[in-house]
């Protein structure tokens, strides 16, 4: 008996071939001997089976002695033995229909679990193997689970169901809902405008939810909510914003926040959360602001940074085109009695400059100028 595997919702074509290459009498029945379809000459006729509105054939093949049974929109319960009767012969085909579905939704939040469930006909013993977009293989029986979904798990999962040495392949598109970056750092000189961007790592037709940015300033004892907003069909509307600082927010995606000026009291870490409609859990992105200030008070030239800096960052003060006068893994450096000229304060990581502030030191008889 020939075995054919089908996928739930798909179309399958069961073949039946006569030795005569012409249109002759044929009919298809199920295992209960109920007629599904056949012909009356060149006309198609259908029997009283439950497949009636989903069963079909292909007229153009009849003249070649081929009398297919086409079953559309396959259901698990279509799994059966189908019998084609033609030229006093019977051809039997066993159809096994499988379905593979993702738990509740194919749009999942980063960190959530994905469960794939296999629907199979009674009496079958299939094995399943799935390959994630990043090449990770998982195997299982009726259910397969992947915990702690990551951004790289977004994309097409390819699952192969094996039964009777035959296989059928399912492709399931999984969207992991997350921000493109888990964390970002913005480096700014005091007084500069600050732009925070929170691009999403996915695109959906309609995006609705609400969000909030909580900020923990380095100088503050507790965190506070800087802004709350709503998202409706990718349109952003601000609900509430603090007076200090007075943030501005873009009306369109990606989520975009503007801080009018970087000040030492704003340096710190923020956590933007986004709760999406019909989803349990929230998306998170951490954002950090590092602010630099270079000042000259009397005979002291000082460079300071505020905010979350890593201990390996180097803060330096140097006269333009000269070697660094002072260079330390600290958040403040200074030079006493600096020479006149253009001084540079540099925050660098392994030689790469992250932030730079220039200050002009005038000869001692005049006051300093900050460009």
């Amino acid at each position: 008996k020939k075995v054919v595997l089908g996928k739930k919702g798909d179309t399958v074509e069961l073949t039946c071939t006569a030795s005569q290459k012409k249109s002759i009498q044929f009919h298809w029945k199920n295992s209960n001997q109920i007629k599904i379809l056949g012909n009356q000459g060149s006309f198609l006729t259908k029997g009283p089976s439950k497949l009636n509105d989903r069963a079909d054939s292909r007229r153009s093949l009849w003249d070649q002695g081929n009398f297919p049974l086409i079953i559309k929109n396959l259901k698990i319960e279509d799994s059966d033995t189908y019998i084609c009767e033609v030229e006093d012969q019977k051809e039997e085909v066993q159809l096994l229909v499988f379905g593979l579905t993702a738990n509740s939704d194919t749009h999942l939040l980063q960190g959530q679990s994905l469960t794939l469930t296999l629907e199979s006909p009674p009496g079958s013993s299939p094995s399943v193997q799935c390959r994630s977009p990043r090449g990770k293989n998982i195997q299982g029986g009726k259910t397969l689970s992947v915990s702690q979904l990551e951004l790289q798990d977004s994309g097409t999962w390819t699952c192969t169901v094996l039964q009777n040495q035959k296989k059928v392949e399912f492709k399931i598109d999984i969207v992991v809902l997350a921000f493109q970056k888990a964390s970002s750092i913005v480096y700014k000189k005091e007084g500069e405008q600050v732009e925070f961007s929170f691009p999403l790592a996915f695109t959906v037709e309609k995006l609705t939810g609400s969000g909030e940015l909580w900020w923990q300033a380095e100088r503050a004892s507790s965190s506070k909510s800087w802004i709350t907003f709503d998202l409706k069909n990718k349109e952003v509307s601000v609900k509430r914003v603090t007076q200090d600082p007075k943030l501005q927010m873009g009306k369109k995606l990606p989520l975009h926040l503007t801080l009018p000026q970087a000040l030492p009291q704003y340096a710190g870490s923020g956590n933007l959360t986004l709760a999406l409609e019909a989803k349990t859990g929230k998306l998170h992105q951490e954002v950090n602001l590092v602010v630099m200030r270079a000042t000259q008070l009397q005979k002291n030239l000082t460079c300071e940074v505020w905010g979350p800096t890593s201990p390996k960052l180097m803060l330096s003060l140097k006269l333009e085109n000269k070697e660094a006068k002072v260079s330390k893994r600290e958040k403040a450096v200074w030079v006493l009695n600096p020479e006149a000229g253009m001084w540079q304060c540099l925050l660098s990581d392994s030689g790469q400059v992250l932030l730079e502030s220039n200050i002009k030191v005038l000869p001692t008889w005049s006051t300093p100028v900050q460009p």
């Epitope: 000459g41 079909d56 054939s57 007229r59 153009s60």
Partner: antibody
């Protein structure tokens, strides 16, 4: 060569019946289905029903169910279509058509049935 | 019942013209469609079966295409003998309905 020769024109009164014959020649009569199609004056084609002369099985369009009977006489290779309870709107040319391997490939010349009081 | 809708219902053309007649089914009929030609006072003649197969003896200027719900009959270069009425018929589900016909006239 294949030929389907139909009986002559008929004039019938409303409420009566008509029986149109279709004599087949040039092929094995029982080996092919026979269909009946009608065409009212100036109108399109309308399928009425079919018959398998080998088994005697028939199928009719719902519209004619209970009024039409298709029969066959194997000995004379003749198919018949009888329509009862005639009304004026049954005035039409009635055709028999053989269903060959490809489709209804041979047709009779048609029989005009006029229903008039 | 499956409804078959032909368009246009009438068409004027000249000898040598390329003509297309369309037929639309109210539901998917796969390729179970035939085209017929009928001349006044005559029985219909089978031109195309299985949507695109040319019946034996029919000139190759006639061709059919389509599948599912939309079908076309094309006459590549009209000849004087082609002026007639054309019908489509579905053979997918009883009652095996015809289209209302397309009358092809000389311009």
């Amino acid at each position: 060569q294949v030929q389907l020769v139909q009986s002559g024109a008929e004039v019938k009164k409303p409420g009566s019946s008509v029986k149109v014959s279709c004599k087949a020649s040039g092929y094995t009569f029982t080996g092919y289905y026979m269909h009946w199609v009608r065409q009212a004056p100036g109108q399109g084609l309308e399928w009425m029903g079919w018959m398998n002369p080998n088994s005697g099985n028939t199928g009719y369009a719902q519209k004619f169910q209970g009024r039409v009977t298709i029969t066959a006489d194997e000995s004379t290779s003749t198919a018949y279509m009888e329509l009862s309870s005639l009304r004026s709107e049954d005035t039409a040319v009635y055709y028999c058509a053989r269903d060959g391997v490809t489709g209804t490939d041979y047709w009779g010349q048609g029989t005009l049935v006029t229903v008039s009081s | 019942d499956i409804q078959m809708t032909q368009s246009p219902s009438s068409l004027s053309a000249s000898v040598g013209d390329r003509v297309t007649i369309t037929c639309r089914a109210s539901q998917d009929i796969n390729d179970f469609l035939a085209w017929y030609q009928q001349k006044p006072g005559k029985a219909p003649k089978l031109l195309i079966y299985a949507a695109s197969s040319l019946q034996s003896g029919v000139p190759s200027r006639f061709s059919g295409s389509g599948s599912g719900t939309d079908f076309t009959l094309t006459i590549s270069s009209l000849q004087p003998e082609d002026f007639a009425t054309y019908y489509c018929q579905q053979s997918y589900s009883a009652p095996y309905t015809f289209g209302q016909g397309t009358k092809l006239e000389i311009k």
